[in-house]
Amino acid sequence: DSSKWVFEHPETLYAWEGACVWIPCTYRALDGDLESFILFHNPEYNKNTSKFDGTRLYESTKDGKVPSEQKRVQFLGDKNKNCTLSIHPVHLNDSGQLGLRMESKTEKWMERIHLNVSERPFPPHIQLPPEIQESQEVTLTCLLNFSCYGYPIQLQWLLEGVPMRQAAVTSTSLTIKSVFTRSELKFSPQWSHHGKIVTCQLQDADGKFLSNDTVQLNVKHTPKLEIKVTPSDAIVREGDSVTMTCEVSSSNPEYTTVSWLKDGTSLKKQNTFTLNLREVTKDQSGKYCCQVSNDVGPGRSEEVFLQVQYAPEPSTVQILHSPAVEGSQVEFLCMSLANPLPTNYTWYHNGKEMQGRTEEKVHIPKILPWHAGTYSCVAENILGTGQRGPGAELDVQYPPKKVTTVIQNPMPIREGDTVTLSCNYNSSNPSVTRYEWKPHGAWEEPSLGVLKIQNVGWDNTTIACAACNSWCSWASPVALNVQYAPRDVRVRKIKPLSEIHSGNSVSLQCDFSSSHPKEVQFFWEKNGRLLGKESQLNFDSISPEDAGSYSCWVNNSIGQTASKAWTLEVLYAPRRLRVSMSPGDQVMEGKSATLTCESDANPPVSHYTWFDWNNQSLPYHSQKLRLEPVKVQHSGAYWCQGTNSVGKGRSPLSTLTVYYSPETIGRR
């Protein structure tokens, strides 16, 4: 209710002789600040005096004086909310009730706190989860209802007296709600920890033992088993007996059922700790183990590999790969079930023993057609020799062999003839399915392996065929030896090497690229006129008049061929120069007079030069010289010079007469 002072603190605090006690405490006074505080030990109210009697452990008054003997007890609070206390060291006779007598200006209050001080350090308390299972992580908690700032302690975990290597997390609480020290240890117990003793040890700051608590671990786990076999190596022959025994080395809780497994599958009606196998067969070879269950689950023993030995079974042959391509590598594998594994093999090709082949595998690095056939083998171990199996068939595939191209026509062949060829071969695996021909052309194949060339070309020199199955085999090319008229006839200038100038010695050659047969005749013509019958046409001194269009002809027994017309160009310096005048050689002053330099030249004139009657050069570079306005003093003889890459030529003088205009005459 509102007439009470409000306090918060732990109800009871625990400590031991020589340690200390720290009392966290808060309060709220009814009115104003605290004016007086007395800490009593086992206070009792005296009705006569209306005061409390008892041992005064601490006293603080308005003047703030504190008796010197009170150093052991300290009030760490304040005048309005904190009432924390410290007793250091604490003694056995401090046990009992502490009374906090508080007085404000108008109000009083007595707050009681229990203090339990033991003679020796009291033990911590270990807390375990309700059930511990192997390999499942659990948290072990060690709790001590003590903590004090002036007295440091530590909690250490031990397993069978040996410090545990897992890291523990220690926490402390010094609050108005609780005072404790706690250590938590995360731990994954194994079945071997079952029954082991775990200790939480309380130590002082120097690691000196103060007290401890111990628990015995109850680790639930599946049965742990050992398997024993007779004979110990578990290797027997068909017809022998085998005994296997299962022993439980540990189980928590107790086991309930027993069973046996072979290659992971349960054996029916085998529910005892002993498995007896009489007159074993090879099928009983395998991995055996026993399985024992409890409430946690099943436990399995290690596996025992039982080997029942027997002579090789009839063998089979595996071929990598068939069909095989000629030239490739092939591997044969002899497969035969046997225990122990076969130590020797005998190989057969088409029923005949293959000498020197005693391994499980036979490798042929380069297969040839004669390697085809049936391959079989026999396996042998210490218990005997197996039987030869049915064998496997090797198919060797190869391109067509000995391919030839054959001409069916009578020889010789002429350009334009129809030619028939056939493609022949000796053997093939698989069968030939198509044919190819080189070079490719728009030719017809009237039947498989036959080629017909209509209108054979002059340049159809050779033909080759290929017979194809999965691969193509090409025959050597066969020469058609086609006969034809001369080809690519052309006129070629032999000399001079550069352009032809007037007066040069000139030789023209009639060239052709090929002719079959090779014997030929030549003919030269210009403008339809026959000039000669040699391969060359010669001019000792060429003149511009020899320029023109020339052709040559070449013929053989098949036909004749003409060249393209070839233009003979003769270069010469400007000639036949003359100066023409427009509008005429007599012009009236003030008008325009145009002088033109006319010439015959090859190449054309590239540069003109003009001169007057005193051979003075005039500053004009064109074919035409325009005088506008023309003056009387311009009257006189003019001449021009033309220049091309061959040389120069000059005109004769041409006279220009400029006469006075009527206006000028009138002024005189």
Partner: antibody
Framework: EVQLQQSGPGLVKPSQTLSLTCAIS??????????WNWIRQSPSRGLEWLGR?????????DYASSVRGRVSINVDTSKNQYSLQLNAVTPEDTGVYYC?????????????????WGQGTMVTVSS | QSALTQPASASGSPGQSVTISCTGT?????????VSWYQQHPGKAPKLMIY???NRPSGVSNRFSGSKSGNTASLTISGLQAEDEADYYC???????????FGTGTQLTVLT
């Protein structure tokens, strides 16, 4: 060193005659390897050749078709100078007028370029 | 007679090369080897830099060179310098009655 010195008015009224003189020093007008030219420059027409005069056995002159009929080039051999007369001028004739020499012989070969120029005269045609 | 065609402007950094083209017809540039090039600084008269396609007058730097192919002539300035910044004009003799024709001019800027 050949030098060309120009003289003449900078302002001419429309329809009047533009008259400029070019005095030559360091060369003779009678040289038979030179021609004496007039060129003008304006923002609208750029550089434009107007005409030339030269002496060989007699005096000759040539004119650009754009001004032929209203242009004449006169020579004064005694003063070694030549002049440009451009009649009936319009504002279109405004620009900088230059006299320039062409030397037609470079050693033994022909040549043709304006190798010496006058300083230029800015002529404005305006009323 | 139409003027010869030149690019309106060209530019280059100091030390670089720049080429200016001049395109005409077979009646002028293509017909004669009388192409010349002129440099003009503002307010000054043109100065002859190249004559007869590729010849250099004495006193002109050998950084200036000229060439011609068909109807197009070219001026190349190598190792550009700040003082090369100017207007450049080409000119050619022509077969028309207007005996000389000039180019439209190219303003060369030297970037700094």
């Amino acid at each position: 060193e050949v030098q060309l010195q120009q003289s003449g008015p900078g302002l001419v009224k429309p329809s009047q005659t533009l008259s400029l003189t070019c005095a030559i020093s360091g060369d003779s007008m009678l040289s038979n390897s030179d021609t004496w030219n007039w060129i003008r420059q304006s923002p609208s027409r750029g550089l434009e050749w107007l005409g030339r005069t030269y002496h060989r056995s007699t005096w000759y002159d040539d004119y650009a078709s754009s001004v032929r009929g209203r242009v004449s080039i006169n020579v004064d051999t005694s003063k070694n100078q030549y002049s440009l007369q451009l009649n009936a001028v319009t504002p279109e004739d405004t620009g900088v007028y230059y006299c320039a020499r062409v030397r037609l012989q470079d050693g033994n070969s022909w040549s043709d370029a304006f190798d010496v120029w006058g300083q230029g005269t800015m002529v404005t045609v305006s009323s | 007679q139409s003027a010869l065609t030149q690019p309106a402007s060209a530019s280059g950094s100091p030390g670089q090369s720049v080429t200016i083209s001049c395109t005409g017809t077979s009646s002028d540039v293509g017909g004669y080897n009388y192409v010349s090039w002129y440099q003009q600084h503002p307010g000054k008269a043109p100065k002859l830099m190249i004559y007869d396609v590729s010849n250099r007058p004495s006193g002109v730097s050998n950084r200036f060179s000229g060439s011609k192919s068909g109807n197009t002539a070219s001026l190349t300035i190598s190792g550009l310098q700040a003082e090369d910044e100017a207007d450049y004009y080409c000119s050619s003799y022509t077969s028309s009655s207007t005996l000389y024709v000039f180019g439209t001019g190219t303003q060369l800027t030297v970037l700094t």
